[in-house]
């Protein structure tokens, strides 16, 4: 037990933030600027992560955690640790090869980002369009063509809500 | 379509100066998210990159030379410039200006280049 | 600087051929990882950026592959026209391009 003791790496006594230094009898020495261990017993220190240029500082880089980056205004995040920035969008729009580009009609987008899709097809459910959609806004179904027959409310009343674990009176 | 012009190459003496112009169109260096740099390649060599400036007037230089480098814009021109001095021998390279990024999606990559500018470094 | 080291330096290859060229980080860089082509008297061209994804009007035989450390460029079919020497290059600190990769005929 002794013997597997004193054959311990000695490098594994350094902490995060510093790499065991070969060239220094073994000592663990501090990360240098720019560069960062998240573990103890590092041989090198990591560079940190550099935001520049679309990409923007979240997180500073420590001597031991990496720098986090986002976006600058006016784009979003895309890929593995934010790898990437997309151009964003209004509502009403997707982008495209040639930039934002309204959504067509019969399709919506009601983010920044991402595609137009299309409106919801209420007559699928056998239901009926209550609001009509828009660039940004989805279709809204209401009920179906027969509840509004003459004599019959245009509106059903909400089903009672039922607490969660109660089974019906 | 965007387009990257570079020129200002030609012979220097050793221990001059240059100063490159990249004419940029089809975009704006001052357009939100832009980054342009410079990059050059030695006869028969590989690339190397050597500045680059975004569209808030952020400079990255490469630490080798960056003591000899200078990356500047002209927003009103649209055009992009890179000063070198104490010239060496080893300097000697085609020159090119590129541009970070592809069209809706930015990063650190180059979708578009200019054709290249010689220079070189003799007595 | 984080160095980037590709391999093989040069092949010889046919058309038709499968062709894989490979680059490795000296540290984890994610996926901040661009490959290039150039041919002779040209600007480089890039081909893929993000390791994986292929830039518009890059045919389809030409896909990237990895993340961290390792990183490989294919070319499915090799055509007359892909004779050239390929480039990585990563962004993931300050810009730097691995040595390149010279893919001639055989």
């Known amino acids: 037990f002794e013997r597997t003791r004193s054959l311990q790496d000695p490098c594994s006594n350094c902490p995060a933030g510093t790499f065991c230094d070969n060239n220094r009898n073994q000592i663990c020495s501090p990360c240098p600027p720019n560069s960062f261990s998240s573990a103890g017993g590092q041989r090198t220190c990591d560079i940190c992560r550099q935001c520049k240029g679309v990409f923007r500082t979240r997180k500073e880089c420590s001597s031991t955690s990496n720098a986090e980056c986002d976006c600058t205004p006016g784009f979003h995040c895309l890929g593995a640790g934010c790898s990437m920035c997309e151009q964003d969008c209004k509502q009403g729009q997707e982008l495209t090869k040639k930039g934002c580009k309204d959504c067509c009609f019969g399709t919506f987008n009601d983010q920044k980002r991402g595609i137009c899709r299309p409106w919801t097809n209420c007559s699928l459910d056998g239901k009926s369009v209550l609001v009509n959609g828009t660039k940004e806004r989805d279709v809204v179904c209401g009920p179906s063509p027969a509840d509004l027959s003459p004599g019959a409310s245009s509106v059903t009343p909400p089903a009672p809500a039922r607490e969660p674990g109660h089974s019906p009176q | 379509e965007v387009q990257l012009v570079e020129s200002g190459g030609g012979l220097v003496q050793p221990g001059g100066s240059l100063r490159l112009s990249c004419a940029a169109s089809g975009f704006s260096l001052s357009t939100s998210g832009v980054g342009v740099g410079w990059i050059r390649q030695a006869p028969g060599k590989g690339l190397e990159w050597l500045a680059l400036i975004d569209w808030a007037d952020d400079k990255y230089y490469s630490p080798s030379l960056k003591s000899r480098l200078t990356i500047s814009r002209d927003n009103s021109k649209n055009t992009l410039y890179l000063q070198l001095n104490s010239l060496r021998a080893e300097d000697t390279a085609v020159y090119y200006c590129?541009?970070?990024?592809?069209?809706?999606?930015?990063?650190?990559?180059?979708?578009?280049w200019g054709q290249g500018t010689l220079v070189t470094v003799s007595s | 600087d984080i160095q980037l080291t590709q391999s093989p330096s040069s092949l010889s290859a046919s058309v038709g051929d499968r062709v894989t060229i490979t680059c490795r980080a000296s540290?984890?860089?994610?996926?901040?990882l661009a490959w290039y082509q150039q041919k002779p008297g040209k600007a480089p061209k890039l081909l893929i950026y993000d390791a994986s994804n292929l830039e518009t009007g890059v045919p389809s035989r030409f896909s990237g592959s990895g993340s961290g450390t390792d990183f490989t460029l294919t070319i499915s079919s090799l055509q007359p026209e892909d004779f050239a020497t390929y480039y990585c290059?990563?962004?993931?600190?300050?810009?730097?391009f691995g040595q390149g990769t010279k893919v001639e005929i055989k």
């Open positions: 590129a541009r970070g990024g592809s069209d809706a999606v930015l990063g650190d990559w180059f979708a578009y």
């Open positions: 290059q990563q962004g993931y600190s300050i810009w730097t």
């Open positions: 540290q984890g860089i994610g996926s901040y």
